[in-house]
Interface confidence: low
Amino acid sequence: GITIPRNPGCPNSEDKNFPRTVMVNLNIHNRNTNTNPKRSSDYYNRSTSPWNLHRNEDPERYPSVIWEAKCRHLGCINADGNVDYHMNSVPIQQEILVLRREPPHCPNSFRLEKILVSVGCTCVTPIVHHVA
Amino acid sequence: GITIPRNPGCPNSEDKNFPRTVMVNLNIHNRNTNTNPKRSSDYYNRSTSPWNLHRNEDPERYPSVIWEAKCRHLGCINADGNVDYHMNSVPIQQEILVLRREPPHCPNSFRLEKILVSVGCTCVTPIVHHVA
C-alpha cells in the first residue's frame, strides 16, 4: 500500500482507532468542470431500455434528495419502437456513500452509510435455463 | 415543511454557518442487506452496450478506489452479435459524493467533493442532424 507522509498542519485528533470520527467540511467542491453539461440528459428516453427517475427524500440523510431509476419495461425497445420480450431491461446499480445523521436529528454529527442506487437501465440478453 | 426537533444529545458545535464542518463516523453502515450480491455483476458482458471496468485509485480520496465504466463499442450489439453503428453505446453517468483529504495527507480532516463517474453503458438511438 501507499504510505502518505502526515502533513504537520493537520488538525489534532486523539482518536487512534479505525473506524474513527473525522472532521468533514460540507462545502462541496465540484471536480466536474470539464464535463459536457448536457451529458446523459436525455438517455433515459432515447435508450432501448428507457427508465423513469423517482425522487427519494430523507431529511436525515445528506444529500437529502436522491433520484432512483426504474426501468419502464421488462423487455427492450426494438427498431420498430415495440417492446421485445426476448431481451431484458435491467437497472444498473451502484453503491454510493451518503452521510446519515447520528444521533438522529443532529445537525453536526453524521455516520458514513453505503446505499445501493439504480442509476439507469441497460438492455441485456436474458439467461435462458434449459430443462434437461 | 417538516421541522425536525434537535436531539438534546447532539455533539456541541460553535459553527453557525452553512457550509460548515461536521463530525463524521467513518464506520460505514451498509444498508444493502437485502440485495442480491450478484445483482448487475454480469450485465457489463450481457448488455447490448457492453462495457469494461477500469480501476481509479486515489489515496487522498475516500473511498480510494472507484471503478469507472468505459463502453466497448461506439455502436450496440445486434441480435447476430455484430456491432450495429445505427445505434450508440453511451455511458450512464452519476454524480457521487466522496471525501477528499484536506489539508492533503491528513488522516482526520476531509472535504466533501462531487465527482462524475460512469457506472455502465446503455444503448440509445442517435440524434440525427439533418442538413437543410
Epitope: 462541496i28 466536474n32 427517475l53 425522487r55 437529502s64 434528495v65 | 454524480e95
Partner: nanobody, 123 residues
Framework: QVQLVESGGDLVQAGGSLRLSCSVS????????MGWFRQAPGKEREFVAA????????RYADSVKGRFTMSRDNAKKQVYLEMNSLKPEDTAVYYC????????????????WGQGTQVTVSS
C-alpha cells in the same frame, strides 16, 4: 420537506423583460439541480431551464435558448430566471423545483409544487 416560493411574475409587453425568483427552504444540500418549469392554460407543464447547485452549469429548452438565463445564489438558497425578448407564447404560470440535473422526467416525481408565479405577455 422542500418548500418553494416563486415570485416576480407580471404582465409585460412582447419584447419586454422579467426576472423571476425562487426561494428554496428545507433542502439541506442538493448535489442535483433546480429547474424552472411552466404551464400554459390547457397545456401540460413543461421544462424551461435547469442549473446545477454545484458548478452552476445550465441547460435550456430549445424554445427559450438565447432569451432566458438561469442563475443561482447558493448562500441565499435562491434561483433566478432572467427572461428577455418575451413572446406571447411565453405566457404561463412559472414554477421552480429541485430535479435530477438534465433529467426532465415525469412531473409527478418531483417534490410538491409551489404556487407558481403568473407571467402574461401581451402582443
Amino acid at each position: 420537506q422542500v418548500q418553494l416560493v416563486e415570485s416576480g411574475g407580471d404582465l409585460v409587453q412582447a419584447g419586454g423583460s422579467l426576472r423571476l425568483s425562487c426561494s428554496v427552504s428545507g433542502l439541506r444540500v442538493s448535489s442535483y439541480a433546480m429547474g424552472w418549469f411552466r404551464q400554459a392554460p390547457g397545456k401540460e407543464r413543461e421544462f424551461v431551464a435547469a442549473i446545477s447547485w454545484v458548478g452552476g452549469d445550465t441547460r435550456y429548452a430549445d424554445s427559450v435558448k438565447g432569451r432566458f438565463t438561469m442563475s443561482r445564489d447558493n448562500a441565499k438558497k435562491q434561483v433566478y430566471l432572467e427572461m428577455n425578448s418575451l413572446k406571447p407564447e411565453d405566457t404561463a404560470v412559472y414554477y421552480c423545483n429541485d430535479m435530477p440535473y438534465g433529467m426532465e422526467t415525469r412531473m409527478d416525481d418531483y417534490a410538491s409544487w409551489g404556487q407558481g408565479t403568473q407571467v402574461t405577455v401581451s402582443s
